[in-house]
């Protein structure tokens, strides 16, 4: 059974992940000129089911495409702290949260999503898991 300290650690990691994802989304939404409409032409794959920490495998598999899109956006006056570091940090948290003992094959939904829909989905996931821990 999870101890209170491990639950607290999980909660803090999820909150960190949540903040990172929200920072990316805010960077997209708060950029006053919608010059970043081209980012919406990139598609992302969504999990069929995302209710447990192990489902973060689906987020992990999409981090490379996410990094590529954000790198392309950087050259269009979209300013985010170093994308490589940010994605690397997210990756580290995701690996710790999902655990490496069980390798899950991610099951994707049929429908793909824009970067905004993708980020919102994983933000909701984090918020949902955090609420169950508190």
């Amino acid at each position: 059974a999870p101890t209170s300290s491990s639950t607290k650690k999980t909660q803090l990691q999820l909150e960190h992940l949540l903040l990172d994802l929200q920072m990316i989304l805010n960077g997209i939404n708060n950029y006053k000129n919608p010059k970043l409409t081209r980012m919406l032409t990139f598609k992302f794959y969504m999990p069929k089911k995302a209710t447990e920490l192990r489902h973060l495998q689906c987020l992990e598999e999409e981090l490379k495409p996410l990094e590529e899109v954000l790198n392309l956006a950087q050259s269009k006056s979209f300013h985010l702290r170093d994308t490589k570091d940010l994605i690397s940090n997210i990756n580290v948290i995701v690996l710790e949260l999902k655990g490496s003992e069980t390798t899950l094959m991610c099951e994707y939904a049929d429908e793909t999503a824009t970067i905004v829909e993708f980020l919102n989905r994983w933000i909701t996931f984090c918020q949902s898991i955090i609420s169950t821990l508190t």
Epitope: R38, L40, F42, L72
Partner: antibody
């Protein structure tokens, strides 16, 4: 209601210059890209380039770079496509369209005929 | 330069299902969009982001995408659907727009 109204048909001789226009209304013109698309007689659609009227940032298709100039005057909500020296092969319908990651609203098209 | 490939023509009888394909190497990661262009008219968006239908577009129009292939499906094609159909996407960078060569749909 979003509208893009283009200037009328033009008949020109080879070597002449030309500037056609596209006036936007019903939305914030400065915060959407405007694209230009060429359609030669009996042929398909070709993307020429886009401009962001807010700061005149412009991207051209490699096929049209150096052949045309795309500009905009945000004070009058108008985008332009111009040629300094027309060729017979420039004969086509030219469409402007609002770009939201894809072209959601289109102008009615401007027919340009270049003939000696 | 990036290319999108469509069949030049597709023919169906009224009421039949018409399928128009579009292939491109970047389509696993880039959305496809579809335009209908009737003779002498400006193009009209019929499908965006692979499968979404703008308001005002009949339900018989649908889109799908798998791997490097996007498909526009017209279920129960009608005579008024006779037109040229163009797929549209962007290159890997997202900067340059590409149209497919167009498909002439004939509803006999």
């Amino acid at each position: 209601e979003v509208q893009l109204v283009q200037s009328g048909a033009e008949v020109k001789k080879p070597g002449e210059s030309l500037k056609i226009s596209c006036k936007g209304s019903g939305y914030n013109f400065t915060t959407y890209w405007i694209g230009w698309v060429r359609q030669m007689p009996g042929k398909g659609l070709e993307w020429m380039g886009i401009i962001y009227p807010g700061d005149s940032d412009t991207r051209y298709s490699p096929s049209f770079q150096g052949q045309v100039t795309i500009s905009a005057d945000k004070s009058i909500n108008t985008a332009y496509l111009q040629w300094s020296s027309l060729k017979a092969s420039d004969t086509a319908i030219y469409y402007c369209a609002r770009d939201t990651g894809y072209f959601d609203y289109w102008g009615q098209g401007t027919l340009v005929t270049v003939s000696s | 330069s990036y290319e999108l490939t469509q069949p030049p023509s597709v023919s169906v009888s009224p009421g039949q299902t018409a399928r128009i394909t579009c292939s491109g190497d970047a389509l696993p990661r880039k959305f496809a969009y579809w335009y209908q262009q009737k003779s002498g008219q400006a193009p009209v968006l019929v499908i965006y982001e692979d499968r979404k239908r703008p308001s005002g577009i009949p339900e018989r129009f649908s889109g799908s995408s798998s791997g490097t292939m996007a498909t526009l499906t017209i279920s129960g094609a009608q005579v008024e659907d006779e037109a040229d159909y163009y797929c549209y996407s962007t290159d890997r960078s997202g900067d340059h727009v590409v149209f497919g060569g167009g498909t002439k749909l004939t509803v006999l």
